[in-house]
């Protein structure tokens, strides 16, 4: 699996997205997990309805959400009030039985909102190059992850370079 | 930017314990694993454990688990790891790190080190 | 435990020549997730060790392009093309995929 980036801003909503085949897994639950590092384990966070049918219906845990389009494929996740914390390695599951299937593998990564101006810790501002178009976009920016690449870290403490 | 902080030497007893600490800083302390190891002059470095600050999640080298302990306090953002019952061939220089990214767990972040010493 | 032999144990070289680094695992080192965790780190004297190439063979950041790292299964590599002052110190490879992960015993690269 790549892994693909999802960027949101601090304080707002970012929603990711996971496609998959509806047929080959059609009836089993989905779940939202957060990996501990990129060889730690997964853990969850939420998952879809017990009701396989139901999967349409939003499910909460704090803040983050979870919803599944069964029919079309794609499985849905809200951060909301995204904050640093909420940083790292997730992956979205396909569960049957005990097993999980990896559906994707996502990088969310925060950035400082532009119109803060209070301390943003270890926020990235995003350069010219990778500004936003709208200072108010909720939904992420996503890209692929090549294997050995590292994105640049989403720090304004950047320079770290040895 | 990224700093670890480790005091510079701990001067100590055989049979007694030490609880090292490491300040993190710069960062957001509960996203990444914090790792020790233990460097012995002429004898390399060694990996004793690592822990992941949001969880407590901890991995150790079967060679140290039943004498050292690996804890952190999230709220000053302070790892430690407790070493008990030391003698001689403790006396090294300890070292916590921090993995570069979430999708580089190479070690790219070093405190400078704990001298221990254990001498009666 | 995996075992990382790392040879030569000292290297004498010239500045300017190439320099070549092994190191042998005692078993295959891919983790379960299919990434191979061997990097490489460079202890200058009385300085803190510093991370030069991670998962075989990417370069960390702000790390010269002279360093490269190689191989795959048992067997890896470390090579700098052209040596500079600033690359003497003590090489240590490192596996990162089961624990309890373990450093190489060091290869400590010198003048000629």
């Known amino acids: 699996h790549n892994t693909t980036v999802f960027q949101g801003v601090a304080g707002q909503s970012l929603q990711v997205s996971c496609p998959y085949d509806s047929m080959k897994h059609w009836g089993r639950r989905k779940a939202w997990c957060r990996q501990l590092g990129e060889k730690g384990p997964c853990q969850r966070v939420v998952s879809t309805h017990n009701l396989w049918l139901l999967s349409f219906l939003r499910r909460w845990n704090g803040s983050t959400a979870i919803t599944d389009d069964t029919l079309g494929g794609t499985l849905t996740i809200t951060l909301r009030n995204l904050q640093p914390h909420d940083a790292g390695l997730y992956q979205c599951q396909s569960l049957h039985g005990s097993e999980a299937d990896t559906l994707r593998k996502v990088l969310v990564e925060v950035l400082a909102d532009p119109l803060d101006h209070r301390d943003a810790g270890d926020l990235w501002f995003p350069g010219e190059s990778e500004s936003f178009e709208d200072a108010h976009v909720e939904h992420s920016i996503s890209r692929s992850l090549l294997e050995g690449e590292i994105p640049f870290p989403p720090t304004s403490h950047h320079h770290h370079h040895h | 930017q990224v700093q670890l902080q480790q005091p510079g030497a701990e001067p100590l007893k055989p049979g007694a314990s030490v609880k090292m600490s490491c300040e993190a800083s710069g960062y957001t302390f509960t996203n990444f694993w914090i790792t020790w190891m233990k460097l012995r002059p002429g004898q390399g470095l060694e990996w004793i454990g690592d822990i992941y600050p949001g969880t407590g999640n901890t991995n150790y080298n079967e060679k140290f688990k039943s004498r050292a302990t690996l804890t952190v306090d999230t709220s000053s953002t302070t790892a430690y790891m407790q070493l008990s019952s030391l003698t001689s061939e403790d006396s090294a220089v300890y070292y916590c790190?921090?993995?570069?990214?979430?999708?580089?767990?190479?070690?790219?972040?070093w405190g400078h080190g704990t001298l221990v010493t254990v001498s009666a | 435990d995996v075992l990382m032999t790392q040879s030569p144990l000292s290297l004498p070289v010239n500045l300017g020549d190439q320099a070549s680094i092994s190191c042998k695992s005692s078993q295959n080192i891919v983790h379960s997730n299919g990434n191979t965790y061997l990097e490489w780190y460079l202890q200058r004297p009385g300085q803190s060790p510093k991370l030069l190439i991670y998962?075989?063979?990417n370069r960390f950041s702000g790390v010269p392009d002279r360093f490269s790292g190689s191989g795959s299964g048992t067997d890896f590599t470390l090579k700098i093309s052209r040596v500079e002052a600033e690359d003497l110190g003590v090489y240590y490879c490192?596996?990162?995929?089961?624990?309890?992960?373990?450093f190489g015993g060091g290869t400590k690269l010198e003048i000629k």
């Open positions: 998962k075989v063979s």
């Open positions: 790190a921090r993995e570069a990214y979430y999708t580089n767990p190479g070690f790219a972040y």
């Open positions: 490192f596996q990162g995929s089961h624990v309890p992960y373990t």
